[in-house]
Interface confidence: low
């Protein structure tokens, strides 16, 4: 059933004629102008109180009637001043005015909190004309009020460029508390105090707050909103929420999880991305971060050779990008590799160790005792050397690379020769006479080319010279290679 709260509306004594409240049952409005489709309200407040007209904002008509009587001031009738209702209820309120018929083109507009209400609001204006006056009732209905409908509503009427304003009608929508600030999930240090905040508003006020931890109330006595809960410290994860109470009932906030920061879990899936003679590129999948962002990671490397001294090399790196190139490793060696990462609480355990190997390396030593001499009869340069002492990890010797540079007036050219690993001598053709030949030799393994020997120079005379002797690598300590002719 629709209940209407009505007050009797009486016309001004000066304006005789029918008016709402004293209308005949067969008296219907001559004209009804709906602004938008109307809805049947659950509650209706009628327009007027009996008696005097409203005296706030009035317009004094300057026109006189045929009998030259001055017309009274125009004003909206008093109406209900304050409506309190619950959220989602319907409400209808109105304002009314009686206007002499000499005025044409009267319009009534609704305003809320200083802004005109346009468009799809449920406003209807009804006109009840009589011989001398027209009673105008402007109704405004809201089918299901929200908090946003709270505010001050007024009617405005323009007549002959004059503006008449009604008394305000205050709408107060009451409902369950509404949260403006809810507790946030946090990651906290064990046994360290932290704060949670909860704030809710009405109307109706006041709003009282109860805190709930793991389904149990924390405070026996409610606190007025806003409330800050100081938790002295936790030793394990907990879920907090807050209850907001007012006269309309109770609203419960979302439950937030408070996690206890812990050391991270160890990384998983450490894998080898790439391996060279002296470096290994690894990647890993980080473990659970312990509710605290990773700060950095430590790569631990130890030689897997049972004869090694067991020392561990440690390389520190940033937590991202879960990738690290371990450098300065020995060639052709086996290593065990583990990864540990840290957050603000501490270091994780080491990941499962993985085995990785470096590839063969390039030789680390140049061939020794390089000797160069001219075999004039065959127009060749003979080169001899001693095989360098190779470490096991340098890999298997596959040969030698010989660089010979020929320099004479205005000419310089370099040639490279590759020779097999078996010999320790080579013969190269004379390229230019009356020139200096500079020879350097490097050993080669599958791991790459080693360092070149110190240069050895020999002068190749013009045809017909007889005196010659070999050139060789100088003894240690000499500053320059010796040229022997």
């Amino acid at each position: 059933a629709i209940t209407e709260a009505r007050e009797e509306a009486k016309p001004y004594p000066l304006f005789p004629g029918p008016f709402p409240g004293s209308l005949q049952t067969d008296h219907t409005p001559l004209l009804s102008l709906p602004h938008a489709s109307g809805y049947q309200p659950a509650l209706m407040f009628s327009p007027t109180q009996p008696g005097r007209p409203h005296t706030g904002n009035v317009a004094i008509p300057q026109v006189t009637s045929v009998e030259s009587k001055p017309l009274p001031p125009l004003a909206f009738k008093h109406t209900v001043g304050h409506i309190i209702l619950s959220e989602h209820k319907g409400v209808k309120f109105n304002c009314s005015i009686s206007v002499p018929n000499i005025y044409q083109d009267t319009t009534i507009s609704w305003w809320k909190d200083g802004k005109e209400l346009l468009g799809a609001h449920h406003a209807i204006t009804q006109f009840y004309p009589d011989d001398e006056v027209t009673a105008i009732i402007a109704s405004f209905s809201i089918t299901s009020v929200q908090r946003s409908d709270n505010g001050s509503y007024i009617c405005k009427m323009k007549i002959n460029n004059e503006e008449i304003v009604s008394d305000p009608i205050y709408i107060e929508v009451q409902g369950l508390p509404h949260f403006t600030k809810q507790p946030e999930s946090m990651n906290v240090t064990r046994n360290t105090a932290f704060n949670l905040t909860c704030q809710a508003v009405g109307p109706p006020e006041p709003v009282n707050i109860f805190w709930v931890q793991n389904s149990s109330r924390v405070n026996e006595q409610p606190e007025k909103s806003p409330s800050v809960l100081t938790v002295p410290g936790l030793t394990e994860m907990a879920v907090f929420s807050c209850e907001a109470h007012n006269d309309k009932g109770l609203t419960v906030s979302k439950g937030v999880q408070i996690n206890i920061k812990a050391i991270p879990s160890p990384p998983t899936e450490v894998s080898i991305r790439n391996s060279t003679a002296h470096s290994i590129l690894i990647s890993w999948v980080p473990g659970f971060d312990g509710y605290s962002p990773f700060r950095n990671c430590s790569i631990q490397v130890k030689e897997a050779d049972p004869l090694s001294n067991g020392s561990v090399m440690i390389f520190n790196t940033s937590a991202l990008p879960h990738l690290y190139q371990i450098k300065q490793l020995q060639a052709l060696a086996n290593y065990s590799i583990g990864v540990s990462c840290m957050n603000e609480i501490g270091w994780s355990a080491v990941s499962p160790w993985i085995l990785a190997s470096t590839t063969e390396g390039a030789p680390s030593v140049a061939p020794l005792n390089v000797t160069v001499f001219l075999n004039e009869s065959s127009d060749n340069v003979d080169i001899r050397w001693m095989k360098p002492p190779t470490k096991q990890q340098d890999g298997e010797l596959v040969g030698y690379r010989i660089s010979h540079v020929w320099q004479s007036a205005g000419i310089s050219k370099e040639l490279l020769e590759e020779v097999g690993q078996n010999g320790s001598r080579a013969r190269i053709s004379v390229q230019v006479h009356n020139a200096t030949c500079t020879v350097r030799i490097a050993a080669v393994t599958r791991g790459g080319v080693g360092p070149f020997s110190d240069p050895v120079k020999i002068f190749i005379p013009a045809h017909g010279w007889v005196d010659y002797a070999p050139s060789s690598t100088p003894a240690p300590g000499n500053a320059d290679p010796v040229l022997i002719i």
Epitope: E184, D289, L320
Partner: antibody, heavy 118, light 108 residues
Framework: SVEESGGRLVTPGTPLTLTCTVS????????MSWVRQAPGKGLEWLGI?????DPVYATWARGRFTISRTSTTVNLKITSPTTEDTATYFC????????????????WGQGTLVTVSS | AQVLTQTASSVSAAVGGTVTISCQSS????????LSWYQQKPGQPPKLLIY???KLASGVPSRFSGSGSGTQFTLTISDVQCDEAATYYC????????????FGGGTE
């Protein structure tokens, strides 16, 4: 140091790729971000790229930009430039990040100017 | 969307005075403290001043300080010098899948 290159005048709709080269540190151990600044305006973060995870973009930049990296460079492709993309583009080293969340941007390039005009 | 609001677009101070710049974050920055401050002078790239809300970047004078946690942060410059006239930006890291970093609008 960080150095951007590739900025120039382009017409709307013409794809453009900016390149960032670094020295003094290795791209294998740092995430990198791109930030832009329109003339007279503030800074806008475009996204972050790391070795281990896919690039993370600002919502407004997704689809409009592509960030990629090689072992020596970081690239930013403006897929279909509009006049609104006129800006100085900075390549920036990310000192530390987790799950694509930058902690701080600690080393900035001088920027390269991109002008989009018909 | 992640939003960092620097309410003052410009502030002024006398040489030797103190100036404060505020920055409000919505939502809270990652770990409550992943908030950094940058200084940018005309024609130059930005320079990192403060990170983790209050930690001084290397080479930055101790007259610069930062404070705050969660959603409210402040940069303070004491004994301010002429050559510190610049635009100052706050920036924060956030834990969502995208928009994991954002800058404030800047304060000149």
């Amino acid at each position: 140091s960080v150095e951007e290159s590739g900025g120039r005048l382009v017409t709307p709709g013409t794809p453009l790729t900016l390149t960032c080269t670094v020295s003094g540190f290795s791209l294998s151990t740092y995430s990198m971000s791109w930030v832009r600044q329109a003339p007279g305006k503030g800074l806008e973060w475009l996204g972050i790229v790391s070795v281990a995870i896919d690039p993370v973009y600002a919502t407004w930049a997704r689809g409009r930009f592509t960030i990629s990296r090689t072992s020596t460079t970081v690239n930013l492709k403006i897929t279909s430039p509009t006049t609104e993309d006129t800006a100085t583009y900075f390549c920036v080293r990310v000192a530390f990040s987790t799950n694509g969340i930058p902690h701080r941007l600690d080393l900035w390039g001088q920027g390269t100017l991109v002008t989009v005009s018909s | 969307a992640q939003v960092l609001t620097q309410t003052a677009s410009s502030v002024s101070a006398a040489v030797g005075g103190t100036v404060t710049i505020s920055c409000q974050s919505s939502p809270s920055v990652y770990n409550h403290n992943w908030l950094s401050w940058y200084q940018q002078k005309p024609g130059q790239p930005p320079k990192l001043l403060i990170y983790e809300a209050s930690k001084l970047a290397s080479g930055v004078p101790s007259r610069f300080s930062g404070s705050g946690s969660g959603t409210q942060f402040t940069l303070t410059i004491s004994d301010v010098q002429c050559d510190e006239a610049a635009t100052y930006y706050c920036a924060g890291g956030f834990s969502s899948g995208s928009d994991s970093f954002a800058f404030g609008g800047g304060t000149e």
